[in-house]
Interface confidence: low
Amino acid sequence: KKVVLGKKGDTVELTCNASQKKNTQFHWKNSNQIKILGIQGLFLTKGPSKLSDRADSRKSLWDQGCFSMIIKNLKIEDSDTYICEVENKKEEVELLVFGLTANSDTHLLEGQSLTLTLESPPGSSPSVKCRSPGGKNIQGGRTISVPQLERQDSGTWTCTVSQDQKTVEFKIDIVVLAFQKASSTVYKKEGEQVEFSFPLAFTLEKLTGSGELWWQAERASSSKSWITFDLKNKEVSVKRVTQDPKLQMGKKLPLHLTLPQALPQYAGSGNLTLALEAKTGKLHQEVNLVVMRATQFQENLTCEVWGPTSPKLTLSLKLENKGATVSKQAKAVWVLNPEAGMWQCLLSDSGQVLLESNIKVVPTW
C-alpha cells in the first residue's frame, strides 16, 4: 500500500495509473467503500462522500492512463485509505494529512519563544525537523519549541514532517520584531553633528508604539532619559526631550536622532527601547558615542577620546609626512614639544581608522 503525506489546507494528488493509455472506467472510494468520484463517458461523476465537493480529477491526464484523484483544502480527517478501481484492479493509497501551526502570533519579539504544534491523524507517529532561515536545525515530535528567538530567526522556517519514510514540507513565515543591530557605535570629533539611526529588522503595515532613549554618559554617575517619543502608523512624534543635549528626531522611519554637537560630556552609551502596541515586551538597541578631542596647550600636544572604547583600540599622534608617531592602547596620548606641522590624531582598530582629527602646530620662535 502506497503512503502519501498531505498538508492541511493544501492540495494532494493520489495517483492511479492504467496500463492502457486511454480513457477507461475508474472509481475512487474511501475505506468504507463510499464512492468519491469516477468516470461516466467523458464526465466526472461524484459520489455521496464528504469529500465530493473537494475532490477532482484532471481530465487532461486521462488520455495518458492517469486517473488521479486530487483532494483540495485537505483536512486532518481526510486521512484514510483510498481505493482506486481501474481495469479490474484495485490500488490502495493511504493518505496522512498533517498540519503545522504556530501556537501564538507569528510576529514575536526578540527573546520570546516560538512553539510550533503538529496536528496529525490518530495512530500516526510523525517526527518533525525545522530549519530556521539562519540555518538552525530543531527536531521534535508533536511540538517544536524555540525558547529564545533571535533576529536571524526572522523569515521562512522550513519544517519537514516525516512518517513511514515519507516527508511533507511546511513553510511558516516568522517575523522577529527587533532592530537590525543589537549595538552600534558612532565615532565623532568634538563639535561635529552626531547622527544615530535605529533601523528595524522588519516591516509592518501599521506600526504603533512608544519609545525612549536612556543615556549613560561616561562622566555622569547615573543615566538619564534624553528623549521620549510616540510612533503612530510609522509617524514619529517627540513627547519630551532634555534641554541638554537638545536632540532632534526624524518624523519618519527609520528612527533617527540628531545630536547637534559631539562633546566629551555626552560620550557614553545609550539604550533605545521601543514598545509596540499589542505586544508584550520591548525592542532594544544599544548605541555608543565616542568623542575625540585634539588640543595644544603650551608645549603639550594632547589627543583624548571619551566614551566606550575597547582596550584593543589604538590612539596615535602622528606628524603628517613624517615618521614621528606616538601610539598607545589608551584613552589619551600626548607629545611634549611637538614639531611644527599638521598632526593627526587617529583612533584605530587593527589598522582600520575609526576616527581622525587634525591639529596644526605652529612653530614657536
Partner: antibody, heavy 116, light 107 residues
Framework: QVLLEQWGAGLLKPSETLSLTCAVY????????WTWIRQPPGKGLEWIGE???????NYNPSLKSRVTISIDTSKNQFSLKVKSVTAADTAMYYC??????????WGQGTLVTVSS | DIQMTQSPSSVSASVGDRVTITCRAS??????LAWYQQKPGKAPKLLIF???SLQSGVPSRFSGSGSGTDFTLTISSLQPEDFATYYC?????????FGGGTKVEIK
C-alpha cells in the same frame, strides 16, 4: 506525482522581454518556493530566482534588476519575465521546485534564443 | 555568493569503473549539498540530497559524502546509463549556486 509543464516564446530579438510560464499539476502548490533555473548552451546551471504562494520572492543579485517572477495561485501557475534581453540570455530555462532544499521535480525546459 | 568548484571538469572511464567527483564550497555549507545528473537534452535529476541521502528511486551505486566545504559523489560501478554530466548544488544561502559540472565520458 507533481508535474511541471512550461511554455513561452522561444525566439527573441535583443532588447525584447523574455516571458515564460510554468503550470504545476497534481502536487502541493502552497508552502513551496517555485523556482526558475537557466542553462546556457554547453554551460552550467544558474539559479534565477523563486517565489512562494504568497508572492514573496528571492532573486539572484546578478539578474535582479531585469527579472520579475510572479504567481497566479488560482491557476497554479508561476511566470518569469526578463527584460532587455541580450545574446547572453540565450539558454534552456527550467521551472522547478525545491522540495525542502533540493530541486525535484523539474519542468521539461524551454530553449530561449536571443538573436537579431 | 558561495562558489562551488567541481573537479575534474571531465573524466573518462569504463563500465564497471569506480568514479569519484569532488565539489568544494568557498565557505562552510554544512551538509546543505545536492548532486544532480543531467543527460543531453534533459532536465537535471536529483541523485543525492543533504550531502549523503539517496533520493528515492536512485540506484545504490551512487553515494555522497562530505561536510563543511569538501564533498564527494561516488559511482561504485559505472553503468552505461551513468555517462552524463554531474552537478553539485549548495542550498546553504542565497543565491543558490551550482558547480561547473563534471562530464563522465566513455573511455
Amino acid at each position: 506525482q507533481v508535474l511541471l509543464e512550461q511554455w513561452g516564446a522561444g525566439l527573441l530579438k535583443p532588447s525584447e522581454t523574455l516571458s515564460l510560464t510554468c503550470a504545476v499539476y497534481g502536487g502541493s502548490f502552497s508552502g513551496y518556493y517555485w523556482t526558475w533555473i537557466r542553462q546556457p548552451p554547453g554551460k552550467g546551471l544558474e539559479w534565477i530566482g523563486e517565489i512562494n504562494h504568497r508572492g514573496s520572492t528571492n532573486y539572484n543579485p546578478s539578474l535582479k534588476s531585469r527579472v520579475t517572477i510572479s504567481i497566479d495561485t488560482s491557476k497554479n501557475q508561476f511566470s518569469l519575465k526578463v527584460k532587455s534581453v541580450t545574446a547572453a540570455d540565450t539558454a534552456m530555462y527550467y521551472c522547478t521546485r525545491p522540495d525542502s532544499n533540493w530541486f525535484d521535480p523539474w519542468g521539461q525546459g524551454t530553449l530561449v534564443t536571443v538573436s537579431s | 555568493d558561495i562558489q562551488m568548484t567541481q573537479s575534474p571538469s571531465s573524466v573518462s572511464a569504463s563500465v564497471g569503473d569506480r568514479v569519484t567527483i569532488t565539489c568544494r564550497a568557498s565557505q562552510d555549507i554544512s551538509n546543505w549539498l545536492a548532486w544532480y545528473q543531467q543527460k543531453p537534452g534533459k532536465a537535471p535529476k536529483l541523485l543525492i540530497f543533504a550531502a549523503s541521502s539517496l533520493q528515492s528511486g536512485v540506484p545504490s551505486r551512487f553515494s555522497g559524502s562530505g561536510s563543511g566545504t569538501d564533498f564527494t559523489l561516488t559511482i561504485s560501478s559505472l553503468q552505461p546509463e551513468d555517462f552524463a554530466t554531474y552537478y553539485c548544488q549548495q542550498a546553504n544561502s542565497f543565491p543558490l549556486t551550482f558547480g561547473g559540472g563534471t562530464k563522465v565520458e566513455i573511455k
